[in-house]
């Protein structure tokens, strides 16, 4: 039989190998996380045995008292920096908040994730705790906040330094004044949502979705954006696991697409360009002391003085090695062979790496490619537990277990809920509601709704994919016709409180209308009736489909606009105009649905995915030049809201069962509450 090819192992310059012995690692760990001090108090300072037993008990490991492989593995697992036994130090007060409206301030950001993703991760992490307690969490913009959130490296202003990549991920302090209550995240980590770097795309046909790493293209696996398959050098990625089958793609941040800041209005780099008489064919840090990469946006900087900063590429910014922070260069030569994606060749540990020049053999410049990263949402949810007064648990499945473990399951365990409810109690039961009426008698004027399923269709934008135009996807199953019966037997599905996600929510005549599968409910805080319904959409607005994406009432004319898929209906009283295609409103073919609307200064804003437009109700046209990114005007709301509506002069952005409420003060929009649609808006009782 042919011999298996031996992989050549190479000594990589700057590859940091820890020189700590197992015993040194154990001593350091046991001291840092409070085990040695507790063991010493019980009179044994020479042997590690008692401290190891404490650790094994606390972390639910086999209690051998030995430095065995399971214990060493646990000690090498990334974790929270808060000690397991005892505390960092003595703290002031009884270590719980004595008010329920907790405020938080995001003092700074990591560059690993877009700001909106960071804000969303924190908001979702707080929402976990507010869902099971009477606590609410409001984002504020000053250090007077109860919880200050900070990304820092090494010594970062609290006397408890971070330790570089991996190891200690974050720490937080128990409730109280000053540093107490604050949560700090190690910015030497790669922060992600737990499944690799988050690279939002532009253009292409995936409506700004993030890259999916790794992805398959022409049978090869890619863990970073690539220029393969294109002749223009613009990096792209697939937004699903397999481009070959799904053909969904977008372009990655690139100086060939745009630049940031500077003075060139975001124009792309011009390569080559002249700077101080020299020619540059790539972004450079020359002429700057801060290490920021820049380029000229005309052929001659010396003459035109026009420049911009090159977008950072999280997917190919290397970690460690001897070129930390630099970009992978593809293709690169290694041992005489060319590589156009990260590789583990030459390494015994299987870690992916790349060269940061075109030739590793010559320059020996390299770094590790980004790994899966740590989920900022999960780590934040854990740290916020500390900021609310929780200690570590010994239940390995619980969120408050000290070790990091990625999961896509709901992270709160019964143990976490018991702990937080011991401190603050459970969510208060709303006052009892009268029974919902079963014979609907709609009193509101009818409104308009769309007629197709809200499946997002592929964009018809003419930008070709890396290997040709994307193939059009299915347009979704046909919607069922409207039901003809008007009364429905009492049934759990008739209770709006049992609806997980509504199709559409809108305010009509000071009442909230909630639509789901051909039916709707009305809710009013001001009237004794609270929730009424369900009513049949077909009885009130016969022209509408069962499934709506969004709706709004124009306050002056009282016209009701209903959207479904690529269609819109406009009801004035009981007369209807439509269905009309969204094109008639000036929305391009790449807008697959309208997901919501808000009133702003005499005009409406129409939302679709991550974008919105100004809509002139009189003219029934959007201003095509008004297209804007949601996260620019509404920082901190989720990037993938399925419904946007206005209620009592505040904007609500819905994602899953949650809403993000946005208030506007002197032109500044800020999230002031995150909660459940059912519990917090409809005041449903909890199970």
């Amino acid at each position: 039989a042919p011999r298996q090819r031996q992989s050549t192992l190479v000594l990589f310059p700057g590859d940091l190998k820890t020189n700590l012995t197992d015993r040194q690692l154990a001593e350091d760990y046991l001291y840092r996380y409070g085990y040695t001090r507790v063991a010493e108090m019980h009179g044994d300072s020479k042997s590690l045995g008692p401290a190891l037993l404490l650790l094994q008990k606390q972390l639910s490991l086999p209690q051998t008292g030995e430095l065995d492989s399971a214990t060493l593995k646990a000690m090498r697992t990334p974790r929270c920096g808060v000690p397991d036994l005892g505390r960092f130090q003595t703290f002031e007060g009884d270590l719980k908040w004595h008010h329920h409206n907790i405020t938080y301030w995001i003092q700074n950001y990591s560059e690993d994730l877009p700001r909106a993703v960071i804000e969303d991760a924190f908001a979702r992490a707080f929402a976990l705790w507010s869902a099971v307690t009477p606590l609410t969490f409001t984002r504020v913009y000053s250090r007077d906040a109860d919880i200050v959130i900070q990304f820092g490296v090494a010594e970062h202003g609290d006397g408890y330094p971070f330790d570089g990549k991996d190891g200690l991920l974050a720490h937080a302090f128990p409730p109280g004044p000053g540093i107490q209550g604050d949560a700090h995240f190690d910015d030497d980590e790669l922060w992600s949502l737990g499944k690799g770097v988050v690279v939002p795309t532009k253009f292409g046909n995936a409506d700004g979705a993030a890259c999916h790493f790794p992805f398959t293209f022409e049978g090869r696996s890619y863990s970073a954006c690539t220029t393969d398959g294109r002749s223009d050098g613009v990096p792209w990625c697939s937004t699903t696991a397999n481009y070959d089958t799904d053909r969904r793609f977008g372009f990655c941040p690139s100086e060939r697409l745009y630049t940031q800041d500077g003075n060139a209005d975001g124009k792309p780099c011009q390569f080559p360009f002249i700077f101080q008489g020299q020619s540059y064919s790539a972004c450079t840090t020359d002429g700057r002391s801060d290490g920021y990469r820049w380029c000229a946006t005309t052929a001659n900087y010396d003459q035109d003085k026009l420049y911009g900063f090159c977008p950072t590429r999280a997917d190919s910014t290397v970690i460690g090695g001897n070129s930390a922070g630099e970009l992978c260069v593809f293709p690169f030569t290694f041992l005489g062979k060319e590589y156009s994606t990260c590789t583990s060749e030459g390494r015994g540990d299987g870690r992916l790496w790349c060269a940061t020049t075109s030739n590793f053999d010559r320059d020996k410049k390299w770094g590790f490619c980004p790994d899966q990263g740590y989920s900022l949402f999960l780590v934040a949810a854990h740290e916020f537990g500390h900021a609310l007064g929780l200690d570590h648990t010994s239940v390995p499945e619980a969120l408050m277990y000290p070790m990091y473990r990625f999961t896509e399951e709901p992270p709160l365990h019964k143990d976490d809920v018991n702990g937080i409810q011991y401190l603050y109690g459970s969510r208060p039961e709303p006052e009892p509601r009268p029974p919902t009426t079963t014979t609907p008698q709609p009193t509101a004027p009818p409104t308009v709704c769309p007629t197709g399923p809200p499946t997002v269709r592929p964009s018809d934008r003419p930008t070709a994919g890396p290997t040709g135009p994307p193939s059009a996807g299915p347009t979704g199953p046909p919607t069922a016709g409207p039901s003809t019966t008007t009364t429905v037997p009492l049934n759990p599905v008739d209770d709006a409180c049992n609806v997980n996600i509504f199709d559409a929510i809108t305010e009509i005549g000071n009442q909230l209308y909630l639509f789901k599968d051909g039916r709707y409910w009305r809710f009013s805080e001001r009237r004794g009736s609270r929730l009424q319904g369900p009513f049949l959409i077909a009885d009130t607005w016969p022209a509408l489909p069962r499934k709506l994406d969004s709706a709004f009432e124009e306050p002056l004319s009282k016209k009701l606009f209903f959207f479904s898929g690529r269609q819109v209906w406009v009801y004035t009283g009981s007369s209807v105009l439509g269905p009309r295609r969204l094109d008639k409103l000036g929305l391009g073919a790449d807008v697959a649905q309208v997901t919501g609307a808000l009133r702003r200064g005499g005009k409406m804003l129409l939302f679709s995915g991550r974008r919105f437009w100004r809509f002139d109700v009189k003219a029934q046209m959007v201003d095509p030049r008004s297209a804007s990114e949601v996260d620019r005007m509404f920082p901190g709301v989720p990037l993938d809201t399925h419904d946007v509506f206005q209620y009592q002069e505040k904007a609500y952005f819905c994602q899953d069962r949650f809403y993000w409420r946005v208030s506007s003060q002197s032109g500044v929009n800020q999230v002031d509450q995150v909660g459940y649609v059912t519990y917090d808006i409809l005041q449903c009782p909890e199970d």
Epitope: Q89, E92, R143, G159, Y160, G176, G178, I179
Partner: antibody, heavy 115, light 107 residues
């Protein structure tokens, strides 16, 4: 309300050591770090060092060998000790509470190094 | 150590004018810059923290901006009582360091 008050010797002979106490009220040393800053006559501010809530310290690298900061949480006092003073150590010495900036300062204590 | 450079030791302005003081860090300090005002014979007073946040009670004519290495402190309409020395300081990494100060003089 928050207050910090430095008390020092005023006059120190060259090569002698300096001890200054900063007594704080209105907040706990368990919740806020305290920094020391000095200002020579007619000059700018020079950061000396900090003691964090847990007792960890960081120092100005140029002065590290002669500087030591400690505290007594129960008495709400922070101590600055500096050895081998020379005439260019003449300055007003301030303690300041820290929380994303030094938000409260003492009135300062004037130290003159002279024989 | 990180060096904070305030390029102007003195700036002369008139009441009602807008004035901007710059501060440059020798390396990236993110947004961890504070600005202090020190009037003759007084202790410094924190005006701006984290580059752009006004401290409680500070008039809104005082603003700060910047991130990375370049920071600006602005008084939108100078008042007579703004006569003072203004210092920037980085608190990104110890040792924390101050700029040399800019003395604002009123014409």
């Amino acid at each position: 309300q928050v207050q910090l008050k430095e008390s020092g010797p005023g006059l120190v002979a060259p090569s002698q050591s300096l001890s200054i106490t900063c007594t704080v009220s209105g907040f706990s040393l368990l919740s806020y770090g305290v920094h020391w800053v000095r200002q020579p006559p007619g000059k700018g501010l020079e950061w000396l060092g900090v003691i964090w809530t847990g007792g960890t310290t960081n120092y100005n690298s140029a002065l590290m060998s002669r500087l030591s900061i400690s505290k007594d949480d129960s008495k709400s006092q922070v101590f600055l000790k500096m050895n081998s003073l020379q005439t260019d150590d003449t300055a007003i010495y301030y303690c300041a509470r820290y929380y994303y900036g030094m938000d409260y300062w003492g009135q300062g204590t004037s130290v003159t190094v002279s024989s | 150590d990180i060096v904070m450079t305030q390029s102007h030791k003195f700036m002369s302005t008139s009441v009602g004018d807008r004035v901007s003081i710059t501060c440059k860090a020798s390396q990236d300090v993110r947004n961890t810059v504070a600005w202090y005002q020190q009037k003759t014979g007084q202790s410094p007073k924190l005006l701006i923290y984290s580059s752009s946040y006004r401290n409680t009670g500070v008039p809104d004519r005082f603003t700060g901006s910047g991130s990375g290495t370049d920071f600006t402190f602005t008084i939108s309409s100078v008042q007579a009582e703004d006569l003072a020395v203004y210092f920037c300081q980085q608190h990104y990494i110890t040792p924390y360091t101050f700029g040399g100060g800019t003395k604002l003089e009123i014409k």
